[in-house]
Amino acid sequence: AMHVAQPAVVLASSRGIASFVCEYASPGKATEVRVTVLRQADSQVTEVCAATYMMGNELTFLDDSICTGTSSGNQVNLTIQGLRAMDTGLYICKVELMYPPPYYLGIGNGTQIYVIDPEPCPDSD
């Protein structure tokens, strides 16, 4: 498979936001790239979000997506929002070179995202 690199561990902010870079080694000059974030919990794999972009253009996720991102060359900067403690898990970056042919696929080893719910503020007298 195509080589895909991503950090091993990321800690989400107190506001439930986690960011990481997904970098891939392209064999050629792809013009259309699809990036998918998958969450693996136990043996279950679910799709978190996905975006297709043209090289040189911005990465656009659906309006209701919890992900946002920017692209630069063979790097994609991904941000996942609205995370809670129960969302702690392994987040895998999947990269597909869609056009021109041939099709190339790469799967990262995953980024373990730790999410800690903030303590509620104590009541003030």
Epitope: A1, S26, P27, I92, P101, P102, Y103, Y104
Partner: antibody, heavy 115, light 107 residues
Framework: EVQLVESGGGLVQPGGSIRLSCAAS????????MNWVRQAPGKGLEWLAQ??????????YYSDSVKGRFTISRDDSKNSVYLQMNSLKTEDTGVYYC??????WGQGTLVTVSS | DIQMTQSPSSLSASVGDRVTITCRTS??????LNWYQRKQGKSPKLLIY???NLASGMSSRFSGSGSGTDYTLKISSLHPDDVATYYC?????????FGSGTKLEIK
């Protein structure tokens, strides 16, 4: 127009050697990983070998059935990929296809291993 | 190594029928699955790539679906021209194993 043209097939005795060539045109050869796939008579498709390109340090991969006997190589200056086949067995008989990462395929060349 | 279990091995259907071929993998291949069409005496042709994407020049009667370990190739309305053997293939990692093939015939 994309073209992959295999050559070098023929009749060879068990234990013998043969070298297949595949000439590519119509696409950027050096951007692609190249593969050899075969089809034995009455059997299905079998992936044999892959050679990646310069960004991947020309890494090679082989199926267990040919590892140690077959060698894949490429020459980007000639837009060509090769399969050196040694210690041939009768079960290596079949049509051999070269393919650019499975998107583009050649017409195939027949290798017959028989005494 | 990733094992590919393709079924059925052969199939006879009538013109206009909806046809389904399945491929099961021994482990999650994350959608890294291609389908090929091989007509008698011809080279294989890429039909579907990445589990769901129709290859250029192939009829929209063909569609691919699936994820994880279970994948499906569907022909919405069988044409006489669809007589061929169909193969699935793992393209996630080496060895890039093919399924055993499904020979499709017209009744």
């Amino acid at each position: 127009e994309v073209q992959l043209v295999e050559s070098g097939g023929g009749l060879v005795q068990p234990g013998g050697s043969i070298r297949l060539s595949c000439a590519a045109s119509g696409f950027t050869f050096s951007d692609n990983w190249m593969n050899w796939v075969r089809q034995a008579p009455g059997k299905g498709l079998e992936w044999l070998a892959q050679i990646r390109n310069k960004p991947y340090n020309y890494e090679t991969y082989y199926s267990d059935s040919v590892k140690g006997r077959f060698t894949i190589s490429r020459d980007d200056s000639k837009n060509s990929v090769y399969l050196q086949m040694n210690s041939l067995k009768t079960e290596d008989t079949g049509v051999y296809y070269c393919t650019a990462q499975f998107a583009y395929w050649g017409q195939g060349t027949l290798v017959t291993v028989s005494s | 190594d990733i094992q590919m279990t393709q079924s059925p091995s052969s199939l006879s259907a009538s013109v206009g029928d909806r046809v389904t071929i399945t491929c099961r993998t021994s482990e999650n291949i994350y959608g890294g699955l291609n389908w090929y069409q091989r007509k008698q005496g011809k080279s294989p042709k890429l039909l579907i790539y990445g589990a769901t994407n129709l290859a250029s020049g192939m009829s929209s009667r063909f569609s691919g679906s699936g994820s994880g370990t279970d994948y499906t190739l569907k022909i919405s309305s069988l044409h006489p021209d669809d007589v061929a053997t169909y193969y699935c293939q793992n393209v996630l990692r080496s060895p890039f194993t093919f399924g055993s093939g499904t020979k499709l015939e017209i009744k």
